[in-house]
Interface confidence: medium
């Protein structure tokens, strides 16, 4: 296989957790025998097994060029490159193969493809019926009892990554953007990566671009906000059910913690406190309706 | 890398059928790509013909929908176009290219062929 | 079908000088997860395409770090820092939000 730019299995390194940090093997790869041995299938994907004690540790130690060169992986994750997504295979002992050259995006309508392999690249479809043009990836509920374009967009499951828009407003992931933009039936854009500051000339907004884009969610990319980037969160334990009232609960790895990741239109530790300043919708048969 | 040869008669007679194939090499066309077709008759700009994925779904431009076909030959790792009922406006450079593509990403058309000449003419 | 709109058509530099291309979709290309599916590609004479940028502002593998493309929704701009003898050629957008994919007319990078 090609070594990874910038360092291949075992020269360098880092690992959940913070710089210098190991995996502990035995979390990672069940094994049948209670012997704790470093053997080649204690610590796959480049890693360097170490006894530590009573248990084994997964060593991956990657030195990792930053340069922005996106591959998908087979996860459904963007790299920043080749080597932090063979990094990640490392890390999760979990083997991440690239798809494809570029960073992975998602499109829940896959057009004119027939598989789920085949993709169709964006096509955007847009549905016209009683309600007149739906746009945004809004769609016509014509059963609804006043008839109105709907947006099914579910932003729950996305991570933290604020964004600043065309209508001057920030939003806490591009998936608030698309929401809000199919909601109001109006287009909205992403202006650039990070909150809006006010240096951001409103009258601007949504015009010539000053060259700052958006970047895709880039999993790996750097030591800070691991919790955020590295996707080591874990299902809550049973004995937290209920924790989250309008969320999902996430046991983080690294900081041994639960946290709430709210659902659309929730704020408060445990996702019990109502958000209005998200969005202003009527809800029709769970879905929401664009007044 | 994956390299593409387009083969295919130089001229054609008006009203007659053109047939191109384009030969893969340096990969499978059974991977994640979308195989195209795109054109440029003399001194103009570029027009996107139509494209085959290696299951056999097809898109195609509207504008020449009603005239061609694109088809795969996955045992001989080729594809390949016919255009009816040509007319001299159908004279141009057809390029065969590879559009990476998938539902989850996206990296355009990053491998093209060198070009074929076709003529309509009698 | 989305229209695109290059300008200028023709553009004469000198090598060394910075250049910049403009290309106008006649609707957004901003996907609904923030990406601009917007490619560029050059054409050397004689030559087939040959691809730059993808989803706005990628470079793709093996183009040097003089070209960038910024812009996004309708309005996306190709530049190049410092023009060598090697960028002549002429540059096509290529909008790949929706089929059928279309390119701009062409902008002739030149000479001056």
């Known amino acids: 296989s090609n070594q990874p730019p910038g360092g291949g299995g075992g020269s360098g390194g880092d690992c959940p957790g913070g710089k210098g940090k190991s995996i502990n093997c035995s979390e990672l790869n069940v094994r049948e025998s209670d012997v704790r041995v470093c053997d080649e299938s204690s610590c796959k994907y480049g890693g360097v097994c170490k006894e530590d004690g009573d248990g084994l540790k997964c060593a991956c130690q990657f030195q990792c060029h930053t340069n922005y060169i996106p591959v998908c992986g087979s996860n459904g994750d963007t790299y920043q490159n080749e080597c932090f997504l063979r990094r990640a295979a490392c890390k999760h002992q979990k083997e991440i193969t690239v798809i494809a050259r570029g960073p992975c995006y998602s499109d829940n309508g896959s057009g004119s493809g027939e598989g789920e392999e085949e993709g169709s690249g964006a096509e955007v479809h847009r549905k016209h019926s009683k309600c007149g043009p739906c746009k945004y990836k809004a769609e016509c509920d014509e059963d609804a009892e006043n008839v109105g374009c709907v947006c099914n967009i579910d932003c729950s499951g996305y991570s933290f990554n604020p964004v600043c828009a065309s209508d001057g407003s920030s939003y806490n992931n591009p998936c608030f953007v698309r929401e809000a933009s199919c909601i109001k039936q109006e287009q909205i854009d992403i202006r650039h990566l990070g909150h809006c500051t006010d240096t951001d000339d409103t009258s601007l907004l949504g015009k010539k671009d000053d060259g700052l884009q958006y970047r895709p969610d880039v999993k790996d990319a750097s030591d800070q906000r691991e919790d955020v980037y590295i996707g080591n969160h874990m299902p809550c334990p049973e004995n937290l059910n209920g924790y989250c009232i309008h969320g999902k609960c996430e046991f983080i790895y690294s900081t041994q913690k639960a946290s709430c990741r709210c659902e659309s239109g929730y704020t408060g530790q445990h996702c019990e406190k109502t958000d209005f300043s998200i969005l202003y919708v009527v809800p029709s048969r769970q879905k929401l309706t664009h007044v | 890398q994956v390299q593409l040869q387009e083969s295919g008669p130089g001229l054609v007679k008006p009203s007659g059928t053109l047939s191109l194939t384009c030969a893969v090499s340096?990969?499978?066309?059974?991977?994640?790509?979308?195989w195209s077709w795109v054109r440029q008759p003399p001194g103009k700009g570029l027009e996107w013909i139509g494209e085959?994925?290696?299951?056999?779904?097809?898109n195609y431009n509207p504008s020449l929908k009603s005239r061609v076909t694109i088809s795969v030959d996955k045992s001989k790792n080729q594809f390949s176009l016919k255009l009816s009922s040509v007319t001299a406006a159908d004279t141009a450079v057809y390029y065969c290219?590879?559009?990476?593509?998938?539902?989850?990403?996206?990296?355009?058309?990053?491998?093209w062929g060198q070009g074929t000449t076709v003529t309509v003419s009698s | 079908d989305i229209v695109m709109t290059q300008s200028p058509l023709s553009l004469p530099v000198t090598p060394g000088e910075p250049a910049s291309i403009s290309c106008r979709s006649s609707?957004?290309?901003?996907?609904?997860?923030?990406?601009?599916?917007l490619d560029w590609y050059l054409q050397k004479p004689g030559q087939s395409p040959q691809f730059l940028i993808y989803?706005?502002?990628n470079r793709a593998s093996g183009v040097p770090d003089r070209f960038s493309g910024v812009g996004s929704g309708t309005d996306f701009t190709l530049q190049i820092s410092r023009v060598e003898a090697e960028d002549f050629g002429v540059y096509y957008c290529?909008?790949?939000?929706?089929?059928?994919?279309?390119f701009g007319q062409g902008t002739k990078l030149e000479i001056k």
């Open positions: 989803l706005g502002s």
């Open positions: 085959i994925y290696h299951s056999g779904s097809t």
């Open positions: 290219a590879t559009m990476v593509r998938g539902r989850y990403y996206y990296y355009g058309m990053d491998v």
């Open positions: 609707q957004s290309l901003l996907h609904s997860d923030g990406y601009n599916f």
């Open positions: 340096g990969g499978s066309i059974s991977s994640s790509n979308w």
């Open positions: 290529m909008q790949a939000l929706q089929a059928p994919w279309t």
